[in-house]
Interface confidence: medium
């Protein structure tokens, strides 16, 4: 039988009546066009909905938009279009929502062709009121908030000017011209690239990287011959053209661009690219594209300096620049990432790492599944996960994998069971241990979401027909109940729940179609009465993360420590609640050689945990640039893996070697930098 349909499934009592009392319909007095939804703040219940409708006339396109606001998690909406003077809002800019709980919102309006500048509507009270502001420029990008101060905004203009506001968009100042890309760094710092000879495209590879730490009063050039730059964790990366040819290399800085080091990564040619897949304050996952139009490359993981890289995964699927990769951070368990590789036979397979890229393996075959037609051996196969690439290929995959930091261990994804990803209709699988083991959760493709920190999982079947049924589970996907939320089926367009998975409300969006009109409609269901009591201590159980052999003393040790969590028992039907905090208990592990990566000039032979000196570098000057200066690099051949907290145990000691280096790439060195003031 399908999961959840056997006798062992306990029923949630009287759920139909409980849910019916907590189902709220809102029909939008609107022609169907496009709809976008934004949550304003955390735990505020405020949702803004922007509907837009385009009527193509003979000479021009006439646009109309409406703005709605809810302050009860979507149960009721009020039309507040009059607060923005019934202005047409440009959907490509979306709704720019301020960081944290600032309550700030910026909407960018469509203006007539001959106007001097654009127009924005600003709110700093969770969209209760808006102020209209005319801009001295036409915006090219959405307004970007400084992460440290929501009053500071930056935007690029259609004429490549960099504009900054210090009073939440009331007054704007152009701080620099000829700007290609601008990003906020930490401490209200702005990094941006500039061109000298005409355009961003023409000067690609000859751009300059600038920094201002005082919102445009003074500037410092921190790099030249720049192709592009990126920020990840505490690292600033620049892709820099080589002196002699058309290749480029990654340089990295951990001091906001004052000093740079050349990353020990392969250089790339014109048709190739680098991509920061994930970054935190400890380390970086970097993808380096293979030469030629292969659609794959190599993942490298960095040391704590972002300089030394270890090869992590070969043949990593990543189509052209800005294309698709399935790389997914499993946020419900530390150290876990999932991605796809392109096999020699061009089939796509899913790989998972539990130790931040140290080792990759296939996903274990779900107990309750058979191997499909892609499997050579019907008894031996793996689970393969559908992610961005499958979605881009228009496979029947409505959603990417889902995990939430406060729903510990839970991962939900579409997948197929075989030797490779299948083009057949996928099913939905769930893991409750961060990806170590999997179970088929639902037959066929579904939309899904996590509520109440994992206490409830909600799903809706992906269908081309109108729907009126929602499924929910209170035991991490083992058993499912179905609830008919409306008599009249709707064409479903999306599930919406508050980011962070703490809410108990879910909104089902769709449209109704009649002979004359089609209208947007939302149904918001509150599950609070299903989980009628608050969880108590007895509802939780101790769970050791990354446990593969409970008797082994080192069991659960990942990156030098193990963590035990208090997790809700599957049998407990209760509310974690909005204030739920994940209870975890870390303890330090003994160090092993696996807690270390090989330093520059060293490598690990296959199936060996010891680092040995690279033969080709013995006695050679190293093309290695530390802070852009000529100096000696001392190393014992090992470096602690970033974020690894192990103590004692193995302490790899070896004679310290002087690695004499020559700096072949010093065009980012301090003496080449200059400053100027406005």
């Amino acid at each position: 039988s399908a999961p959840g349909e056997d006798e062992e499934c306990g029923r949630v009592r009287d759920f139909v009546a409980k849910l019916a009392n907590n189902t709220h319909q809102h029909v939008f007095d609107d022609l169907r066009g496009s709809v976008s939804l934004s949550w304003v703040g955390d735990s505020t219940g405020v949702i803004l909905v922007l509907t837009t409708f385009h009527v193509p006339l003979v000479i021009m396109t006439f646009g109309q938009s409406k703005l709605y606001r809810s302050e009860d998690y979507g149960k009721n909406f009020k039309d507040i279009t009059d607060l923005i003077n019934n202005t047409f809002i440009r959907t490509e800019f979306g709704m720019a929502i301020g960081p944290e709980n600032s309550g700030k919102v910026v909407l960018t309006a469509e203006v007539s062709g001959g106007s001097r500048g654009g127009r924005i509507f600003r709110s700093s009270d969770f969209a209760k009121n808006f102020v209209q502001t005319d801009l001295p420029f036409h915006p090219l990008t959405q307004m970007m908030y400084s992460p440290q101060n929501s009053d500071y905004l930056l935007a690029l203009s259609t004429e490549n000017g960099l504009w900054v506001s210090k009073n939440f968009g009331g007054k704007w100042e152009e701080i620099h011209k000829a700007v290609c890309l601008a990003k906020w760094g930490s401490d209200n710092t702005i990094f941006f690239t500039t061109y000298a000879n005409g355009s961003c495209k023409a000067d690609l590879g000859a751009l300059e990287l600038w920094r201002t730490s005082d919102l445009g009063k003074s500037f410092k050039t921190i790099g030249v011959k720049i192709y592009s730059f990126g920020l990840g964790g505490r690292f600033l990366f620049a892709s820099v053209m080589a002196d002699k040819d058309t290749t480029r290399r990654i340089h990295v800085s951990t001091d906001q661009g004052d000093t740079w080091s050349m990353a020990q990564l392969p250089s790339v040619g014109q048709e190739q690219f680098y991509s920061i897949l994930a970054a935190n304050d400890d380390m970086v996952f970097m993808h380096v594209d293979e030469p030629g139009d292969t659609g794959f490359g190599t993942i490298f993981t960095s040391d704590d300096r972002g300089i030394v890289y270890s090869k992590s995964l070969d043949r990593h699927l990543y189509t052209t620049t800005g294309g698709e990769t399935d790389f997914t951070n499993v946020t419900s368990l530390r150290g876990v990432y999932i991605t796809s590789v392109l096999s020699e036979d061009n089939s796509i397979q899913t790989m998972i790492t539990f130790d931040q890229g140290g080792r990759w393996t296939h996903l274990r075959k779900p107990e309750n599944s058979e191997c499909d037609a892609t499997a050579k051996n019907k008894n031996e196969c793996s689970l393969h996960i559908h992610a961005s690439y499958s979605i881009s290929q228009k496979l029947n995959v409505p959603m990417a994998p889902l995990s939430e930091p406060n729903a510990v261990g839970i991962v939900i994804a579409h997948g197929s069971v075989g030797d490779a990803i299948s083009v057949m209709v996928p099913d939905v699988y769930i893991s409750d241990d961060g990806g170590y083991s999997w179970t088929k959760m639902l037959e066929g493709p579904h939309y899904y979401t996590i509520l109440d920190s994992g206490g409830i999982i909600v799903a809706i079947e992906h269908s081309s027909r109108p729907i009126n049924v929602i499924k929910f589970s209170t035991d991490e996907g083992q058993c499912w109940q179905t609830y008919t939320f409306t008599r009249d089926p709707i064409y479903f367009t999306g599930l919406a729940s508050e980011p962070g998975a703490r809410s108990m409300n879910i909104s089902i969006w769709g449209f109704t179609e009649s002979f004359l009109t089609s209208q947007w409609v939302s149904y918001t269901i509150d599950f609070k009465d299903i989980l009628e009591r608050n969880c108590e201590e007895k509802d939780y159980t101790i769970w050791l993360a990354h446990s593969t052999d409970p008797e082994d003393y080192e069991d659960g040790c990942i990156l030098g420590y193990k963590e035990q969590f208090l997790r809700l028992r599957k049998s407990s039907v209760c509310q974690n609640g909005r204030d739920y905090v994940v209870t975890k208990q870390p303890s330090i592990c003994l160090c092993s050689l696996e807690d270390f990566l090989c330093d520059f000039g060293y490598y690990r032979p296959e199936n060996d945990s010891k680092c040995v000196e690279q033969p080709e570098l013995k006695g050679h000057d190293l093309e290695f640039c530390l802070y852009g200066r000529e100096e000696h690099l001392t190393t014992n051949g090992y470096r602690k893996i970033p974020g690894d907290k192990c103590q004692g145990g193995v302490n790899p000691v070896r004679e310290v070697k002087d690695l004499k280096k020559k700096c072949t790439s010093n065009f980012l060195s301090p003496e080449k930098q200059n400053s100027k003031s406005n």
Epitope: D549, E551, Y553, K562, I588
Partner: antibody, heavy 118, light 107 residues
């Protein structure tokens, strides 16, 4: 029945050496980390050293580092503590203790007395 | 090193009394604390692990509470076999460290 039995204690002069043993039975010895803990005459407990289940990784308290060596022989279900350069302050009852991944001192032996005196 | 300060060093009590022993860690240790019992001539016995979890076979009159830096062992109704020495131990970080011990004796 899960059991740990220490042996090898005795009287030794300062600067001397001693080797303690701990025989384990009633559980799969090779899957547990093992520790030595000592109790001074004033009843204070001090953790001395730990060894991982496979024997690859060891860790020592600063007071014994460089003088004591913990080791194990999983084929014999035995844990050892080689004590060199003994000092008067090493006088104590020495206990071996089992560590699982969930709980670090869940089974103890009866202890063996080591007296360092001239 | 993390210091574990245990108090009181001794407590006089009668059968049926509620006894409370506390341990303070010099820095946060999450719930990485265990409580041990020592009786003369007997091996140490583990009572509580991870601050609050009762080891299998230990009577429910023993309970642990606290997290972070302050922890408590409570014997809700003292029984004759409970007169013994009690120690806390932290295992959040190497080196593992013990409290000075609390002697529970007959009043």
């Amino acid at each position: 029945e899960v059991q740990l039995v220490e042996s090898g204690g005795g009287l030794v002069q300062p600067g001397g050496s001693l080797r303690l043993s701990c025989a384990a039975s009633g559980f799969t010895f090779s899957t547990y980390g093992m520790s030595w803990v000592r109790q001074a005459p004033d009843k204070r407990l001090e953790w001395v050293a730990i060894i991982s289940s496979g024997g690859s990784y060891t860790y020592y308290s600063d007071t014994v580092k460089g003088r004591f060596t913990i080791s194990r022989d999983n084929s014999k279900n035995s844990l050892y503590l080689q004590m060199n350069s003994l000092r008067a302050e090493d006088t104590a009852v020495y206990y071996c203790s089992r560590s699982s991944s969930h709980w670090y001192f869940d089974v103890w032996g009866q202890g063996t007395l080591v007296t360092v005196s001239s | 090193d993390i210091q574990m300060t245990q108090s009181p060093s001794s407590v006089s009590a009668s059968v049926g009394d509620r006894v409370t022993i506390t341990c303070h860690a010099s820095q946060g240790i999450s719930s990485n604390i265990g409580w041990l019992q020592q009786k003369p001539g007997k091996a140490f016995k583990g009572l509580i692990y991870h601050g609050t979890n009762l080891k299998d076979g230990v009577p429910s009159r023993f309970s642990g509470s606290g997290s972070g830096a302050d922890f408590t062992l409570t014997i809700s109704s003292l029984q004759p076999e409970d007169f013994a020495d009690y120690f806390c131990v932290q295992y959040a970080q190497f080196p593992y460290t013990f409290g000075q011990g609390t002697k529970v004796e007959k009043r």
